[in-house]
Interface confidence: medium
Amino acid sequence: MPRNPGCPNAEDKNFPQNVKVSLNILNKSVNSRRPSDYYNRSTSPWTLHRNEDRERYPSVIWEAKCRHLGCVNAEGNVDHHMNSVPIQQEILVLRRESQHCPHSFRLEKMLVAVGCTCVTPIIHHMA
Amino acid sequence: MPRNPGCPNAEDKNFPQNVKVSLNILNKSVNSRRPSDYYNRSTSPWTLHRNEDRERYPSVIWEAKCRHLGCVNAEGNVDHHMNSVPIQQEILVLRRESQHCPHSFRLEKMLVAVGCTCVTPIIHHMA
């Protein structure tokens, strides 16, 4: 079906500054697969740290921090010839605009570390 | 505390299922750091696939797919004693409710794979 010319593209510079958003969330149970134990079983394991902000939705965000600088080898030892690095993802959150307007929000971007991966280091050779 | 006249009307039958959201995004340049090359250097490398939907904000989302079932070892070969697995994150996006209502959106959850990590497999012993 052709798009209604009255519907601006969300990336358009003329896109409305304020929109009405329904909080009846679609795909509410998309998360029925629960958090995995990859953080423990990874060769670049990570811990989860609680980031809480009561003026934001979601109020509590758990951020990954790599446990080691190196990666865990088959023997369970940390190999410093490899690097554990965070995989970061930009997410949208809702920021309450004002305490006096509890139902007015602003979109905010946040960069969160979701987990860690093991990479080969970049070797800088001296001249 | 008296209600701010600029706030959405609490008498509205849809209140507070609908809220006002400003799209004047805070921390817009949070991702000004150049995308890393971890996807290529990881022992669990991945490719990025473009997921585009004009009725969604953001319209373009990049999803990771692990290149191998196993992980890449120091010799550059795939070791099938280890597993490459996607690290998934649930994100909030805005879905246009109707082509005829350009300023009405609904929050939607999406599960996206951000990257891959290398894990020790769970061994199921036969009885």
Partner: antibody, heavy 126, light 107 residues
Framework: EVQLVQSGAEVKKPGESVKISCKAS????????ISWVRQAPGQGLEWMGG????????DYAQKFQGRVTITADESTTTAYMELSGLTSDDTAVYYC???????????????????WGQGTTVTVSS | EIVLTQSPDFQSVTPKEKVTITCRAS??????LHWYQQKPDQSPKLLIK???HSISGVPSRFSGSGSGTDFTLTINGLEAEDAATYYC?????????FGQGTKVDIK
């Protein structure tokens, strides 16, 4: 550790209303939801409805729709459940339960009830 | 609404024995299934969340498994203090619903 403390026992007559409070301490009140669950004598658990504090959204079980109202007062970190048009069938212990709202390891909204109030006994009798 | 059916309704068990309680959902609920323990005149207590995730402070003898429509709560080596009623709870679809409960008694 989140603690939920409920108001005391109530005795009501048929047709009356009851309003029970649930005071939360420990943890940010806005970071979780509160559900209300009741248990009739010798019976199982029955979910009545819940509120998500951040947006103030309420969800009610169809059975109680129109008869139950769940509210929250952030300034006192207290949730309330009001049930009207009481009958003897509403004689039960009423519990408030915390529903976490964490973006846990990349996931929004965990829906287990990880902390419960001590329960409020409501007796409806003429 | 989603109906959860627990079995058995009642179980009398000797200490140190293994107890298995099952919970069947009327439709697929993924892993949105939680287990609670309720002792007489007490509030329910969360034992297992999301089918198999353990809760800190809950003894390791309690474990959960299953996904989709069939779930199991296992108590490995029952202790006297485990005498209680056990409930399963689904949070996949509103309204939240509970199983009818399984009463576990010590012989």
């Amino acid at each position: 550790e989140v603690q939920l403390v409920q108001s005391g026992a109530e005795v009501k007559k048929p047709g009356e209303s009851v309003k029970i409070s649930c005071k939360a301490s420990g943890g940010s009140f806005r970071s979780y939801g509160i559900s209300w669950v009741r248990q009739a004598p010798g019976q199982g658990l029955e979910w009545m409805g819940g509120i998500t504090h951040f947006f103030g959204i309420t969800d009610y079980a169809q059975k109680f729709q129109g008869r139950v109202t769940i509210t929250a007062d952030e300034s006192t970190t207290t949730a309330y459940m009001e049930l009207s048009g009481l009958t003897s069938d509403d004689t039960a212990v009423y519990y408030c339960a915390r529903e976490p709202n964490d973006f846990w390891n990349g996931y929004y909204d965990t829906h287990d009830f990880d902390s419960w109030g001590q329960g409020t006994t409501v007796t409806v009798s003429s | 609404e989603i109906v959860l059916t627990q079995s058995p309704d009642f179980q009398s068990v000797t200490p140190k024995e293994k107890v298995t309680i099952t919970c069947r959902a009327s439709q697929n609920i993924g892993s949105e299934l939680h287990w609670y323990q309720q002792k007489p005149d007490q509030s329910p207590k969360l034992l297992i969340k999301y089918a198999s995730h353990s809760i800190s402070g809950v003894p390791s003898r309690f474990s959960g498994s299953g996904s989709g429509t069939d779930f199991t709560l296992t108590i490995n080596g029952l202790e006297a203090e485990d005498a209680a009623t056990y409930y399963c709870h689904q949070s996949d679809t509103l309204p939240h619903t509970f199983g009818q409960g399984t009463k576990v008694d010590i012989k």
